[in-house]
Interface confidence: low
């Protein structure tokens, strides 16, 4: 067990703070909840503290919860591939470029680390080149979320990882908006981290609303499990 992994044996409170600017539309989001890495479970509620969110909530799910991948459940035989927990408590910097097909892009930078007993994800998001009447600024996405695989590989030069995946957002007309994600994570501290073999995270997310909440918000339940490396994976490469 890595030193960081010991911090995730029980339920951990989570705080998410985001400051965003998409095509000049500025906004802030605050999220609170908890994570349980034993089950790979996240429960979070996000509130737009600046009024109405200028982009659809589903476009921010990867920035919020895929940001705290330290809560992913890594099976026993894969624990030596869990970069995310090994970087704790000092944490990691997570940077992404998200390309929305035939539309604009988000660039995000986050610091994910423990502040006391709370896991905090502080994010800056900048979005550019979006069409005002497109799927994103035109709010044409359905309020739901698909399952995805998130592919992870070591980046030895930067003592971190590279991650890429493609998100499928459902559009109200029945079509799909694709969003390419290019991600890199680097540790904040100087301590040793686990550099993984190639594997993936299997994600399942459910979006809902709090009937008692008047502000623009999103409630998220998510389960994330690492996979893709078997007990005998060495045999595959002989």
């Amino acid at each position: 067990m890595s030193k960081g992994e010991e911090l995730f044996t029980g339920v951990v409170p989570i705080l998410v703070e985001l400051d965003g600017d998409v095509n000049g539309h500025k906004f802030s989001v605050s999220g609170e909840g908890e994570g349980d890495a034993t089950y790979g479970k996240l429960t979070l509620k996000f509130i737009c503290t600046t009024g109405k969110l200028p982009v659809p909530w589903p476009t921010l799910v990867t920035t919020f919860s895929y940001g705290v991948q330290c809560f992913s459940r890594y099976p026993d035989h894969m624990k030596q591939h869990d970069f995310f927990k090994s970087a704790m408590p000092e944490g990691y910097v997570q940077e992404r470029t998200i390309f929305f097909k035939d539309d604009g892009n988000y660039k995000t930078r986050a610091e994910v680390k423990f502040e006391g007993d709370t896991l905090v994800n502080r994010i800056e998001l900048k979005g550019i080149d979006f069409k005002e009447d497109g799927n994103i600024l035109g709010h044409k996405l359905e309020y739901n979320y698909n399952s995805h695989n998130v592919y992870i590989m070591a980046d030895k030069q930067k003592n971190g990882i590279k991650v890429n995946f493609k998100i499928r957002h459902n559009i109200e007309d029945g079509s799909v908006q694709l969003a390419d994600h290019y991600q890199q994570n680097t540790p904040i501290g100087d301590g040793p981290v686990l550099l993984p073999d190639n594997h993936y995270l299997s994600t399942q997310s459910a979006l809902s609303k709090d009937p008692n909440e008047k502000r623009d918000h999103m409630v998220l339940l998510e389960f994330v499990t690492a996979a893709g490396i078997t007990h005998g994976m060495d045999e595959l490469y002989k």
């Epitope: 695989n149 592919y151 890429n164 493609k166 390419d180 594997h199 993936y200 893709g228 490396i229 595959l236």
Partner: nanobody, 120 residues
């Protein structure tokens, strides 16, 4: 691609696809099929960086996709073949690791295809 041909229902075939090293490495390699008058369908794919596989529901339990890193080759082992498996089968290289299971638009390089015919 190679390995296509004609076979009786219940029989087996093994398709092979060799690609360049740069295309093969840490990419998604997919097998597609297209029957006359039908859309091209992704039947199976594999992420070569980690042996991660995807299968269409129609072939789960019958088809197996595998890889040989030393030969830059992916295989499609097709067992318990049915007449409805008759189609032209294509090997394709994805745009990246995310392409597996994403359909033909997310694949960049395509083979010429090999015909598989299953008779009853």
């Amino acid at each position: 691609e190679s390995g296509g041909g004609s076979v009786q229902a219940g029989g087996s075939l093994r398709l092979s696809c060799v690609v360049s090293r740069s295309t093969y490495t840490s990419n998604c390699m997919g097998w597609f099929r297209q029957a006359p008058g039908k859309e091209r369908e992704e039947v199976a794919s594999i992420y070569t960086g980690g042996g991660i596989t995807y299968y269409a529901d129609s072939v789960k339990g019958r088809f197996t996709v595998s890889q040989d890193n030393a030969k830059n080759t992916v295989y499609l082992q097709m067992n318990s073949l049915k007449p409805e498996d008759t189609a032209m089968y294509y090997c394709a290289a994805g745009r990246g690791s995310w392409s597996c299971g994403m359909g033909p638009d997310e694949y960049k390089y395509w083979g010429q295809g090999t015909q598989v015919t299953v008779s009853s």
